[in-house]
Amino acid sequence: TPEVWVQVQMEATELSSFTVHCGFLGPGSISLVTVSWGGPDGAGGTKLAVLHPELGTRQWAPARQARWETQSSISLALEDSGASSPFANTTFCCKFASFPEGSWESCGSLPPSSDPGLSAPPTPVPILRAD
């Protein structure tokens, strides 16, 4: 069964900078990746970025840079311009649409005890559904 993993990492040098890493474990070709925060895409979450393998990437503030890391994983850099960091308690979700499997989505957040530079464990937490 395909799985999606999500890691959230606080940058050690800039406490207002976070990176979300997501990956797809499974066969099939990825047709679209959607990253959202505050919940899953289409279920209360706010879209942060869309990555299409051919057409490119589109992102919304506070996302700073979305990019493919491999053919099955992406990263999204976020920058909090405010004094406090709302990202620390936020859930980030990644949805991978693939053919022929359908859509798979998982969410993750920075562990409360995380020190800068540490990341959430890469354990897949398949919430929601396979569309």
Partner: antibody
């Protein structure tokens, strides 16, 4: 063929607002994001933002977030950009541009541009 | 934001000559998924709106003469006009279409001697 029609010129007073229009024809209006680009006289091009006519979702260049507001009217296949609190720095030609899904940010079709002059 | 830098700012060439202009980006425009470079070139003739010439660094848009050749990868890109014609008098802009916000270079003005 794809056409994006824009009025030729607008003369506005400092501090006022102006709403620029871009009427699309020759393609399905809701199928492509509409982009807006600024060009000051003799200078380069700056991307202001984009709007998805199918759902109204917008995306702005941070630099223009408090300056521009993008909207669409499906019934007339027209995109609009409102510019507020105008100053001389806003005097420029403003283009609308749509893309043909070659890539998210290629601007394949351009309007002729509206020249905005801010003067008292 | 990705910064795009073009050079030279202007050049004057005779009809039939080969023209090359450069565009550099502050970060790589190479998409590691498909190994494509997300770089476009536009031509803007005097008094007209810009026109897309090349995208994905080297793919000519439909109807663009084959004397326009885009090349390069990563952060360094070139637009070559193999044999310049009088109608090529224009400003040429590069633009990254890699990510939001798309950004343009300052342009290269091509004059015909």
């Amino acid at each position: 063929q794809v056409q994006l029609q824009q009025p030729g010129a607008e003369l506005v007073k400092p501090g006022a607002s102006v709403k620029l229009s871009c009427k699309a024809s020759g393609y399905t209006f809701t199928s492509s994001w509409m982009h807006w680009v600024k060009q000051r006289p003799g200078q380069g091009l700056e991307w202001i933002g984009e709007i998805n006519p199918s759902d109204g979702r917008t995306n702005y260049n941070e630099k223009f977030k408090s300056k521009a507001t993008l909207t669409v009217d499906h019934s007339s296949s027209t995109a609009y950009m409102q510019l507020s609190s105008l100053t001389s720095e806003d005097s420029a030609v403003y283009y609308c541009a749509s893309n043909a899904d070659r890539a998210y940010y290629t601007m394949d079709y351009w309007g002729q541009g509206t020249s905005v002059t801010v003067s008292s | 934001d990705i910064v795009m830098t073009q050079s030279p700012s202007s050049l004057a060439m005779s009809v039939g000559q080969k023209v090359t202009m450069s565009c550099k980006s502050s970060q790589s425009l190479l998409n590691s998924f498909n190994q494509r470079n997300f770089l476009a070139w536009y031509q803007q003739k005097p008094g007209q709106s810009p026109k897309l010439l090349v995208y994905f660094a080297s793919t000519r848009d439909s109807g663009v003469p084959d004397r326009f050749i885009g090349s390069g990868s990563g952060t360094d890109f070139t637009l070559t006009i193999s044999s310049v014609q009088a109608e090529d008098l224009a400003d040429y802009f590069c633009q990254q279409h890699y990510s939001t916000p798309p950004t343009f270079g300052g342009g290269t003005k091509l004059e015909i001697k």
